[in-house]
Interface confidence: low
């Protein structure tokens, strides 16, 4: 198809050679087509434009992306030729940085339903280059953590070395949606919730005497809890004595709750005390029975094939430990009467 009628946008991706980072292109179809086509969920029924040139399907992935080879060859379908580029709805994700991503990318609707649609396309000229500015050694990461329940901020990596005063106006997107109120190089979050997690994109415009282009960076934001300050607690067994029947098999379960730690090396084991002797028991593997953002519950059982008289004189001790400290719970077996 003829791409001479496509609207054109120039973008710059300056990537850090020290870190892994991703990049995205949005299919910025001209209004009102874009509203109808890619971001329909932003419109209430009353806001639907009267004239919609694109009458394609409601499928949000209904755009086609191409790359224009620099040698003038025909346009190439992105999905067939570029495994490191993934299309998600109206967004093109570049999974790996590198100057070989430089080039012209064209998006347009898959379904051409009217003469208007032919000229409905966007050509994005992407320039990719490694970061050379050594003066900004501590630029913000493309992976940023927000601590749940606290105040935090998300910084635009390409602008993080500039003060707020000298920073240009920034356009922010979260998971492909425009954050219209954010215009600074830093988003301040008063209280962090899990919904703040996602893929953020920050854009600003740079110009010279000849032309202007958009500088874009992508930030993956995760919400995390702080490392626990508590040693693990044993949820089961609660009682320190257990009634048993002699000669019968017995399973005693130890369940412990471990708070979140980034470096997580939980220990849960059983050992037996018999007068002055103490030894660790070889028991089945521990298993995680519940895992949440804040903590993990791990269980480990001790199995006695047959309870003997000798077992009644022993103490069975569950020992749990994390980087903060350890906790134990001992159980004495008592013969069931009657």
């Amino acid at each position: 198809f003829n791409i001479s009628g496509c609207s054109t946008k120039k973008l710059l991706w300056t990537y850090s050679t020290r870190s892994e980072e991703e990049f995205v292109l949005f299919c910025d179809l001209p209004e009102p087509q874009k509203s109808h086509f890619c971001h329909r969920n932003r419109l209430s029924p009353k806001q639907v434009p009267e004239h919609l040139p694109f009458m394609g399907s409601n499928d949000l992935s209904d755009v086609q992306w191409y790359q224009q080879p620099s040698n003038g060859d025909p346009l190439e379908d992105i999905r067939k030729s570029y495994p490191h580029i993934i299309q998600d709805k109206c967004t093109l994700h570049f999974l790996t940085p590198g100057v070989n991503n430089s080039g012209s990318y064209i998006c347009r609707p898959k379904m051409i339903k009217s003469p208007y649609d032919v000229a409905c396309c966007v050509k994005m000229i992407l320039e990719v280059k490694p970061q050379t500015n050594a003066s900004c050694e501590y630029s913000a990461s493309h992976k940023q953590d927000l601590l749940l329940g606290s105040t935090g901020s998300i910084s635009c990596p390409s602008l993080s070395c500039q003060s707020d005063a000298q920073s240009p106006a920034v356009t922010w997107y979260k998971n492909g949606k425009l954050l219209s109120v954010e215009r600074s190089n830093r988003i301040v979050v008063d209280e962090v919730y899990d919904y703040h997690q996602g893929t953020y994109v920050c854009d600003y415009t740079q110009s010279d005497t000849v032309s202007s282009w958009t500088v874009r960076a992508v930030v993956q934001v995760r919400t995390i809890v702080g490392d626990t300050k508590l040693k693990p607690d044993i949820l089961d067994p609660v009682e320190d004595t257990l009634e048993v029947e002699l000669g019968k098999p017995l399973t005693i379960s130890c369940k412990a709750r471990f708070g979140f730690e980034r470096v997580f090396n939980p220990v849960i084991k059983w050992y037996i005390k018999d007068s002055d002797l103490e030894w660790e028991v070889s028991v089945p593997e521990a298993k995680s029975i519940k895992s949440t953002l804040k903590d993990e519950i791990i269980e480990r059982n001790i199995i006695l094939e047959k309870v003997t008289q000798r077992d009644l004189r022993r103490k069975f001790v569950c020992f749990v430990q994390n980087s903060i400290g350890n906790t134990t719970q001992s159980v004495q077996l008592k013969e069931k009467r009657g």
């Epitope: 870190s19 892994e20 495994p83 490191h84 999974l95 790996t96 992976k143």
Partner: nanobody, 124 residues
């Protein structure tokens, strides 16, 4: 989808060496950061080492730093873990993993694909 198949595990004496391999099927292998985790009896799965999509960045758990080396060959769709100066506490099932995002603290938070695991036993 990416399928991962580990090999190279076995029984070795303390102080010895082993080289684990993880063969990946799928065209997009080179887009993924790759890593190794291990699970010893009675413990939960723990991070061992990871390597970025390009091989330019590597990350190691403190317990294996200086003894283990992770590498990858994108042409062969394979990631390797060279384990030297093995200790009895390295005994575990070793799992290969693939993830689209990688920085040291994230790898393992949301793993896209896991292998089935290979047993490594270090005797004293």
């Amino acid at each position: 989808d990416v399928q991962l198949q580990e090999s190279g595990g076995g029984l070795v004496q303390a102080g010895g060496s082993l080289r684990l391999s993880c063969a990946a099927s799928g065209r997009t292998f080179s887009s993924y950061a790759m890593g190794w985790f291990r699970q010893a009896p009675g413990m939960v799965r723990e991070f061992v080492a990871a390597i970025s999509w390009s091989g330019g960045s590597t990350y190691y758990a403190d317990s294996v730093q200086g003894r283990f080396t992770i590498s990858r060959d994108n042409a062969k769709n394979t990631v390797y873990l060279q384990m030297n100066s093995l200790k009895p506490e390295d005994t575990a099932v070793y799992y290969c993993a693939a993830d689209r995002s990688l920085s040291g603290s994230y790898f393992g938070a949301t793993i896209d694909y896991w292998g089935q695991g290979t047993q490594v036993t270090v005797s004293s």
